[in-house]
């Protein structure tokens, strides 16, 4: 018998679509073979119809595809606009159709129920609202006006215009008789349940004048949607639920194995631990639609989920629902880079964030996750150059290493820096990945004077201090702007092997900045690095001041002043909303540190070392 | 929670037929799917037979021993889901249980199925 299996019948009616799932072995070889659904003929023959390698026959054209889902050893193939003309017999199958393992489905396409004449159908899904209509003639406006549900022979009264309202729909049910003039009144119909499917009468007047009208209600339980997504990247689940309950509390929530529904996050305030620095409920828009977005994908995310609209926040019966099916793909395009990274207060980290390298061009952006409500991110930097105030002097987002990866460094690391923060472009938005920023005890490995005052037309000198684990890195120091930093020309002094040796002596590398002007003020940076792949920085504000007295500035770490104030975050924050993904430029306005003017260049500034050996660290 | 009760088993001849109804009731959420499992003494239990659906689609999936003798159908205005048994055997001599799901992985699988009915008899003598 063959290990392929599936629906053997499927029965649907005319204008239908339907999803016929086929199952496989999931071997290496099952999974990358071809996937085809054939439709068999009186000769015995099956003939392709759609495939796994993009055919499409014509009679499927549009309306037709078929997609693999390696991970489960599954595929599926979902056919719309169903005709009678698609009765019959198929295979599902892998391989060649003649001598594939495959599994015999039968199609059965009705014309589906026959109705009275002049029935109007209402499709509508379970917990949503439907709106019946109604007309009569004048004679009868001013008649009992009513709605009745046929049960086989009989007709049950629903709701009439003299207050009469059915048990069964109590408090989810309203007759509306306009003003005269309009022939026509309206039954609505909230919270629509499975049982409320069905065939019902509208009636105005009695006797043989009295208007009828049939309306069949199907009342539809929400199909899954299938999302696929990748390892360690990011779904959103787009939730559009109805104006009806635009104003009511919403909900993400996931199925367990009990078939009941965990609350992933509500609109009331709950979120899974789980879920912790990883999701974001965006704002509703005035339609009552919302989405939430969850990144940095595990395995364990795999499962149902529902979003829904009730006051508790969570699962109710008979309230509108969607619903989806996540897959997580194991073979992920998206790299691995590490989830949590370790620095010490007063030192730096540097965070390697993918994105999708087909999309280079991209803007960059990296955001702090904050779980207060429905959590939000505001933009701290972007690839443009634009820095949150307070962030000034410390914290840069550069394009290296490029091809997939860009880098974020954040220095001068205090304990409220630790939390979760997420990167993303304004490109693929499967790419946006987390990472949580922990501070540890320690004390940082580079070492640098706090506040320097220059003084004008003089020289500075300025020391940075490493261990010897960095010895053979290279490294730099740089000018930091809200565009990035500058990496000054550094000059190499004294022989090599005072390095190699590690003389404690030499463990220094010095900005010179001769002379100084007033465009040296501002942040420098110095740091290590490997390639292009960033370690450990350290960040020195240089102040310059007019000329009192004559000679060279020297300065030692032990004449470090304080750092300066840190300035308060503004109000006004760029925050990932569901348009701002898409479109950057949709953020809300906030203030930017103003450039800081030219870089220090050119010969006047140059920094000793007396290594020119190539390598790099990390923070991580 | 969903309960599932079954009933319709019974005592019958090799050849016979008989037909097992579960009815399913408290609904938290809607059931995409509803099938039977069946368990024969002393070994495990296994699947017979399920049908998932969306609106007026309906997806009937068999076990290969079943080879056109058992039918599941389903009454949506009762919710209740029915086995035809045709051409008995005895060994399809088992207890035969409801069970329930949002069904989306492979309906085959025991643990795809959340909710259970306590199992109803089928004899089939020779």
């Known amino acids: 018998k063959s290990p392929v299996f599936g629906p053997q019948e499927v029965s649907s009616v005319e204008g239908n679509s339907v999803s016929i799932k086929c199952y496989y072995p999931p071997t290496s070889v099952n999974r990358h073979t071809r996937k085809y659904w054939c439709r068999k003929g009186a000769s015995g023959r099956c003939i392709t119809l759609v495939s796994s390698e993009g055919y499409v026959s014509s009679n499927y054209a549009g309306r037709a595809n078929l997609t693999n889902f390696p991970e489960n050893g599954t595929f599926v193939v979902n056919i719309a606009q169903l005709s009678r003309d698609d009765s019959g017999h198929y295979k599902c199958g892998l391989g060649i159709n003649s001598r594939g393992l495959s599994f015999d489905v039968s199609l059965e396409v009705s014309q589906g129920p026959e109705l009275p004449n002049g029935t109007e159908v209402y499709t509508v899904d379970v917990g949503r609202t439907v709106t019946i209509k109604c007309p009569f003639k004048t004679e009868n406006a001013p008649k009992t006006k009513a709605l009745y549900k046929k049960i086989g022979q009989t007709s049950v009264l629903v709701i009439d215009s003299r207050n009469y309202v059915n048990p069964n729909y109590k408090d989810r049910i309203r007759l509306r008789i306009p003003g005269t003039g309009q022939l026509i009144f309206t039954v609505v119909i909230d919270r629509l349940r499975l049982s409320d499917h069905g065939l019902y009468l509208c009636q105005a007047g009695d006797g043989s004048n009295r208007d009828e009208k049939n309306a069949d209600l199907q009342v539809l339980e929400p199909e899954p949607e299938l999302v696929y997504e990748d390892l360690r990247g990011s779904v959103t689940f787009h939730c559009a639920l109805g104006l009806e309950v635009a104003n009511v509390a919403k909900f993400l929530c996931r199925v367990n194995s009990r078939e009941t529904c965990d609350v992933v996050i509500n609109t009331l305030g709950k979120r899974d631990s789980a879920f912790e620095g990883r999701i974001l409920l965006n704002p509703q828009d005035k339609d009552g639609s919302f989405s939430v977005v969850i990144t940095g994908l595990r395995k364990e995310d795999e499962g149902r989920y529902l979003c829904g609209a009730h006051s508790d926040g969570q699962l109710q019966e008979g309230w509108p629902i969607q619903a989806w099916q996540l897959f997580v793909n194991e073979e992920s395009t998206i790299p691995r880079s590490p989830t949590v990274v370790k620095g010490v207060a007063g030192g730096s980290v540097a965070v390697l964030c993918p994105y999708n390298p087909k999309e280079s061009q991209s803007l960059k952006y990296w955001c702090l996750w904050e779980g207060a409500q429905n959590g939000r991110c505001p933009l701290l930097v972007e690839s443009q150059g634009l820095v949150q105030e307070q962030y000034e002097g410390r914290l840069s987002l550069l394009q290296e290493p490029g091809n997939g990866t860009f880098t974020v460094i954040l220095n001068q690391l205090t304990t409220q820096d630790a939390g979760f923060y997420w990167c993303l472009t304004n490109g693929d938005t499967r790419w946006r990945t987390t990472v949580e920023i922990k501070i540890i005890e320690g004390e940082p490995n580079l070492k640098v004077p706090g506040n320097v005052t220059a003084v004008l037309g003089e020289t500075l000198n300025i020391p940075c201090h490493f261990p010897c684990k960095f010895s053979s890195y290279e490294k730099y120091w740089c000018k930091w702007s809200n565009t990035g930093c500058q990496t000054l020309p550094s000059q190499d002094e004294g022989p090599s092997e005072a390095f190699v040796n590690c003389d404690e002596n030499s463990r220094l590398v010095s900005l010179t900045l001769n002379p100084v002007t007033r465009a040296d003020e501002g942040w420098y940076w110095c740091g290590v690095k490997q390639g292009h792949f960033y370690g450990e920085t350290a960040a020195v504000y240089v102040a310059v001041e007019e000329k009192k007295v004559a000679g060279s500035r020297y300065v030692s770490p032990a004449k470090a002043d304080a750092a300066p104030d840190e300035k308060v975050l503004d109000s006004g924050v760029r925050e990932i909303e569901n348009k701002a993904i898409q479109d950057p430029r949709l953020f809300a306005e906030e203030k930017v540190v103003a450039d800081t003017g030219d870089q220090a260049g050119g010969s006047r500034a140059s920094v000793d070392s007396s290594s020119s050996e190539e390598q790099g660290g990390s923070s991580k | 929670q969903v309960q599932l009760v079954e009933s319709g088993g019974g005592l019958v001849q090799a050849g016979d037929s008989l037909r097992l109804s579960c009815a399913a009731s408290?609904?938290?959420?809607?059931?995409?799917?509803m099938g039977w499992f069946r368990q024969a003494p002393g070994k495990e239990r296994e699947f017979v037979a399920t049908?998932?659906?969306?609106?007026?689609?309906?997806?009937?999936y068999y076990a290969d021993f079943v080879k056109g003798r058992f039918t599941i159908s389903r009454d949506n205005a009762k919710n209740t889901v029915y086995l035809q048994m045709d051409s008995l055997k005895p060994e399809d001599t088992a207890v035969y249980y409801c069970?329930?799901?949002?069904?989306?992985?492979?309906?085959?699988?025991?643990?795809?199925?959340?909710?259970w009915g306590q199992g109803t008899q089928v004899t089939v003598s020779s």
């Open positions: 049908i998932r659906w969306s609106g007026s689609t309906q997806y009937k």
């Open positions: 069970a329930a799901t949002t069904l989306l992985g492979d309906p085959r699988a025991l643990n795809e199925y959340a909710y």
């Open positions: 408290g609904r938290t959420f809607p059931t995409y799917a």
